[in-house]
């Protein structure tokens, strides 16, 4: 059918709760493209009717909720004027019963998120919640071993649980819970997190190192397309978020209307002692207002910026 297969993504998911997957592959999805979702090589696209339990919401596929029988390979087809790309997403739905006494104890969370806290440090856990704008998420509650977390050492900040002065007792089974509202209906999202404790600072200390950019300026012509990578090395067990910000706002939020500047999908390469992460920023069309503005790459507590600069006039052209 002339479509180029980009990659296959595997996702293992909890049943009986919402799930969403966004079909983005910068710079392909940055331009004028149409995105269509299909299930198991079906010729019939996933419904776009918002009342459907499984439906496409802009570039997302949304399950409200995910359940038994939804496992399978879903394809996202990205069509441009002269191109066609396809992303395969292999979804496996797992039955999950947090604290349901009829099962007898907690589930095996090996397939869920695994996060690490560093002993004696102030650290944090992250609740990964990725949903389209049509989904409104309520405040996040945190649980440890089925009990809601309370106490002075714990602070909930947006999607994170801040833990001060981490102790060995902080290891265990955590869950973050939020109520998601979509089209007037409410759903519970519950993510299990297996938390272990480490003493070692790991590769280059526990602070991520931004290899590139290096707080410098980049000469770029007005109106051109520009992609800049942020390369970060961090410990294999890190829980740091990596992102691009402008004016202290995520670029995807700052340019939410125009989508002219977007953050790319993070990739990483595993080395024996550390991981090398790459997350890019794409300027579809550089505008005058972009010059002189620091675009910040954040990785945990580390930051580095680029500033766009107009090239010096080339007098040889005259």
């Amino acid at each position: 059918d002339g479509c180029k297969d980009i990659f296959m993504k595997n996702e293992i998911l909890s049943a009986s709760q919402p799930f969403a997957f966004n079909c983005t592959f910068p710079p392909i999805t940055s331009g004028e493209v149409s995105v269509t979702w299909y299930k198991n090589s079906s010729k019939i696209p996933v419904s776009k009717i918002i009342q459907s339990r499984i439906h496409q919401d802009e570039t997302w596929i949304l399950f409200l909720p995910m359940e038994w029988g939804d496992s399978g390979v879903y394809q996202c087809v990205i069509k441009g004027r002269d191109s066609c790309h396809r992303i395969h997403v292999n979804l496996t739905v797992f039955e999950k019963h947090w604290c349901d006494t009829s099962i007898g104890g907690l589930p095996n969370l090996s397939d869920e998120y695994k996060q690490i806290l560093h002993l004696g440090k102030d650290d944090s856990l992250t609740c990964h919640l990725h949903f389209p704008k049509s989904c409104v998420l309520g405040p996040i509650k945190w649980y440890k071993d089925c009990n809601e977390i309370k106490g002075e050492r714990f602070t909930v900040l947006e999607t994170r649980l801040l833990v001060s002065n981490v102790s060995a007792e902080d290891r265990g089974n955590y869950a973050c819970q939020a109520i998601l509202t979509h089209s007037g209906k409410q759903y519970e999202v519950l993510n299990g997190i297996t938390v272990s404790i480490t003493e070692r600072a790991g590769y280059g200390g526990s602070v991520p190192k931004i290899i590139y950019p290096k707080n410098h300026s980049i000469e770029v012509q007005l109106g051109t397309t520009l992609i800049v990578d942020c390369n970060v090395t961090d410990t294999k067990d890190n829980t740091n978020l990596r992102c691009w910000r402008v004016n202290n706002t995520l670029v995807d939020d700052y340019y939410d209307e125009s989508k002219r500047i977007r953050e790319g999908v993070e990739t990483h390469v595993s080395f024996r002692e550390h991981n090398l992460y790459t997350v890019n920023i794409t300027f579809l069309e550089v505008k005058m207002e972009d010059y002189g503005l620091p675009f910040m790459c954040h990785a945990g507590v580390s930051t580095a910026y680029i500033i766009l600069q107009l090239p010096a006039p080339d007098f040889r052209a005259y």
């Epitope: 009986s16 038994w68 496992s71 797992f94 039955e95």
Partner: antibody
Framework: EVQLLESGGGLVQPGGSLRLSCAAS????????MSWVRQAPGKGLEWVSA????????YYADSVKGRFTISRDNSKNTLYLQMNSLRAEDTAVYYC???????????????WGQGTLVTVSS | DIQMTQSPSSLSASVGDRVTITCRAS??????LNWYQQKPGKAPKLLIY???SLQSGVPSRFSGSGSGTDFTLTISSLQPEDFATYYC?????????FGGGTKVEIK
């Protein structure tokens, strides 16, 4: 304690209809897939139908497709089997069962009700 | 649809005997095979799921093996309460199907 209690069985004429119910207790019903299995007198087990947690996915044996409808009401903790155009060969004890799939693929019925007898005869 | 063939359809054995029941699928079902026990007038009871995982509360004398198309249920030392009918079931794809059953009787 997990309990499944079927009801609604009885004697019905060929071509008639019947609705079976299965009342569930002792577990969070809305988080489990459910199924119906039947057993004709003196015969083996035959899988009839299954339904996902919120009812979004339903499955049927070829022998009942188009005639039987599985459904559930999570607010009432109840599973249903609407049986239309009944035939003599549908005569059986009908069991409801809780379906598990902790490994993602493959599933099994870990709790069963005691069954309700459906007799189709003129 | 996947057909499940069980053998033997019946067998006679004594207490303490080692009993083996086989189940064959018409196509590969990976490890998506379960075994159930049923006594007269009672509902079936889950013994083994996923070929070899013992359901909670089931005695360790029951074991399962196999993969693909050929599977075995073994009772290492038959006990009086084990005289019943045993069914295999595939859960690889719907419609899920049962084997015809194996009746284990007292010799």
């Amino acid at each position: 304690e997990v309990q499944l209690l079927e009801s609604g069985g009885g004697l019905v004429q060929p071509g008639g209809s019947l609705r079976l119910s299965c009342a569930a207790s002792g577990f969070i019903f809305s988080r489990y897939a459910m199924s119906w299995v039947r057993q004709a007198p003196g015969k083996g087990l035959e899988w009839v139908s299954a339904i996902s947690e919120s009812g979004g996915n339903t499955y049927y044996a070829d022998s009942v497709k188009g005639r039987f409808t599985i459904s559930r009401d999570n607010s009432k903790n109840t599973l249903y089997l609407q049986m239309n155009s009944l035939r003599a060969e549908d005569t059986a004890v009908y069991y409801c069962a809780r379906q598990r799939y902790p490994g993602g693929s493959g599933s099994y019925a870990d709790y069963w009700g005691q069954g309700t007898l459906v007799t189709v005869s003129s | 649809d996947i057909q499940m063939t069980q053998s033997p359809s019946s067998l006679s054995a004594s207490v303490g005997d080692r009993v083996t029941i086989t189940c064959r699928a018409s196509q590969s079902i990976s490890t998506d095979l379960n075994w159930y026990q049923q006594k007269p007038g009672k509902a079936p009871k889950l013994l083994i799921y996923g070929v070899s995982s013992l359901q909670s509360g089931v005695p360790s004398r029951f074991s399962g093996s196999g993969s693909g198309t050929d599977f075995t249920l073994t009772i290492s030392s038959l006990q009086p309460e084990d005289f019943a009918t045993y069914y295999c079931q595939q859960s690889h794809s719907t419609p899920f199907t049962f084997g015809g059953g194996t009746k284990v009787e007292i010799k």
